[in-house]
Amino acid sequence: MPEPGKKPVSAFSKKPRSVEVAAGSPAVFEAETERAGVKVRWQRGGSDISASNKYGLATEGTRHTLTVREVGPADQGSYAVIAGSSKVKFDLKVIEAEKAEPMLAPAPAPAEATGAPGEAPAPAAELGESAPSPKGSSSAALNGPTPGAPDD
């Protein structure tokens, strides 16, 4: 039990950063825990995420990765990573096709535990100045390029 007035020690030594990606590209979020063997959960809008053709979940030692494949405007919004009692929120912002390059034909994906399908190889930019929100999206405004804020 932490002393009154003192924040509990975060389970994360590296927190995911909010990013901005072109529609059709993958978005990759990384977190590092203080030690290996820590069970990590990822969420979107408070809803748990499980591995699928859409979501790649990988763990190597202390490094935990969430890959959101072929992002579309509907993927824009608030995400979180949870380890123990530590929860860190971060955001995904999607730049629509008319503001970015169109989706590329699927290319061979790097090997991943969940067997990723082809992904358009486009880098995710750390979130800086906010661009206009995609039409029809009711996601909240995004933070700047700082690691996600803890929400313990």
Epitope: G46, S52, E70, A74, P117, S138
Partner: antibody
């Protein structure tokens, strides 16, 4: 096992509002999103909106001005309220769980039939 | 909104035949596409998510392919219990939209 069950009024007068409850079991609403989808008689499926685990919502812009989705996690219930109903709102209304592997809908209720008529 | 166009509207088959359903999106949606089956007087049932990933408990005779704008659902040997309506749905952008459906009927 995962179950969703809708309950509604059956008959609604034109210009009145519609309230439907979706009661779920086998999973917690804090960790899953729930969608609302409707199907007019003899026609296809139409997505109305959804509520996320954290209570945030996304709506079909066509209905956003007269649609509200909310929930009570402790009662495992999700609520749909639609105002100003017209005869073309006659449909079967379904609630469906959002798949944790993405935005598909993995489990559906049996639906509740709503007729808008005077 | 993204328009999902399904063809044909009706497919007539004999048991044991291989059948293909087509769904075309009005814009590139990657693989953000799902297939559902709805039997008469029943609720929709998820068959395939993200174009090609079979949902748990779905018979192996169902498969999905496609990416971008063109998608296909196949049943490699139709059984009588497969007689139903089939819908595609995109989750690339809000609002989520469904195709008008293809009705599978017996010859």
């Amino acid at each position: 096992q995962v179950q969703l069950k809708e309950s509604g009024p059956g008959l609604v007068a034109p210009s009145q509002s519609l309230s439907i409850t979706c009661t779920v079991s086998g999973f917690s609403l804090t960790g899953y999103g729930v969608n609302w989808v409707r199907q007019p008689p003899g026609k296809g499926l139409e997505w109305l909106g959804m509520i996320w685990g954290d209570g945030s919502t996304d709506y079909n812009s066509v209905y956003k001005s007269r649609l509200s989705i909310s929930k009570d996690n402790s009662k495992s219930q999700v609520f749909l309220k639609m105002n100003s109903l017209q005869t073309d709102d006659t449909a079967r209304y379904y609630c469906a769980r959002r798949d944790t592997g993405g935005a598909s809908m993995d489990y559906w209720g049996q639906g509740t039939s709503v007729t808008v008529s005077s | 909104d993204i328009l999902m166009t399904q063809s044909p509207a009706i497919l007539s088959v004999s048991p044991g035949e291989r059948v293909s359903f087509s769904c075309r999106a009005s814009q590139n949606i990657g693989t953000n596409m799902h297939w559902y089956q709805q039997r008469t007087n029943g609720s929709p049932r998820l068959l395939i998510r993200f174009a090609s990933e079979s949902f748990s408990g779905i018979p192996s005779r169902f498969s999905g392919t496609g990416s971008g704008t063109d998608f296909t659902l196949r049943i490699n040997s139709v059984e009588s219990e497969d007689i139903a309506d089939y819908y595609c749905q995109q989750s690339y952008n809000w609002p989520f939209t469904f195709g008008a459906g293809t009705k599978l009927e017996l010859k």
